[in-house]
């Protein structure tokens, strides 16, 4: 079958998910497509523990995550509820700043150099993190 029971080569397993950390930069949409071609999605941060894990791997580098408000409200790419979920914005963020002069506001979220989140122009070529969940069937203990 096509069950995912272990992580692909060069992906990092953590808490039953697999993560891939880019070494180059892309616009948010291209990073999103990259992950989707790998049957994954841009990382969705659901806990402080996951935040620290990702932060440890990316270091002090602007890095896209799977959170955007391009269609209005903030949404996680996998459907995780934003309003009730984990958040780690920098103070006074998100601010949908228009002062950058690139047209429009700021609709895509990224980790900043200290790990806290900021919204920025989606066309900026930042690094990114892909995440895919291991199949639930593979998490069950073997029958004795």
């Amino acid at each position: 079958g096509s069950e995912r029971t272990c992580c692909p080569v060069n992906w990092v397993e953590h808490e039953r998910s697999c993560y891939w950390f880019s070494r180059s930069g892309k616009a948010w949409a291209d990073a999103d497509n990259y992950c989707r071609l790998e049957d994954a999605h841009l990382v969705v941060v659901t806990s402080w523990e996951e935040q620290k894990f990702v932060q440890r791997h990316i270091g002090p580098v602007n890095t896209w995550m799977g959170l955007h408000d391009q269609n209005g409200p903030w949404k996680w790419v996998d459907g995780t509820d934003y309003e009730t979920g984990f958040k780690n914005w920098r103070p006074e963020q998100p601010d949908d700043w228009y002062g950058h002069g690139l047209g429009g506001g700021e609709d895509c979220a990224h980790f900043t150099d200290d790990g806290r989140w900021n919204d920025d122009v989606c066309q900026r070529p930042y690094r990114w993190v892909c995440e895919t969940e291991l199949d639930k069937a593979s998490q069950e203990p073997p029958l004795l």
Partner: antibody, heavy 123, light 107 residues
Amino acid sequence: EVQLLESGGGLVQPGGSLRLSCAASGFTFSSYAMSWVRQAPGKGLEWVSAISGRGGNTFYADSVKGRFTISRDNSKNTLYRQMNSLRAEDTAVYYCAKKDYDYVWGSPYFDYWGQGTLVTVSS
Amino acid sequence: DIQMTQSPASVSASVGDRVTITCRASQNISNWLTWYQQKPGKAPKLLIYAASSLQSGVPSRFSGSGSGTDFTLSISSLQPEDFATYYCQQTDSFPFTFGPGTKVDVK
């Protein structure tokens, strides 16, 4: 040994439909994204579509969006391409290609290609 | 879409010659560039990926370089089996566009 074998090409009238198949062997099919690339007679290569390993995500060139559909059956190790509303400019050899990626940078590339199947759209 | 251009469109060369083909992207694609060789009636064959990594089984006379927007494929000493058409392709963003090709033929 990795093998990709396309089939289903032939002569079809404008506006008609055709389904191409690509039978894969020699690798874990469901672990790899696949693509279709075409080449009009005497012309260059044109990427037309891609599908993720599990088949959940698909990508298309604007020239075929809404007319062509890429799909796969991992239980049969087979890639498909449904072509509807065919036009004369769709006449080409169609190749299926297996995607791999550079483990350092992550950049994708097509490491294995089928021999191609010719689709001719003409009245 | 990212546009890819190649130069020259064709090159006439002799066995033993050094041949250099250039590929240019309309925007920065980092090193997300691949080179293929194609002979008449055959499928393309992977030569170089990630701009400079030689595919397993490809002779070491082939080499790739470049990053950003400008890339080069070099054949250090042309062999009879190298007469073919060479294509670059960017895989930085969809659609994965190819260059128009460079035909290497006999002088």
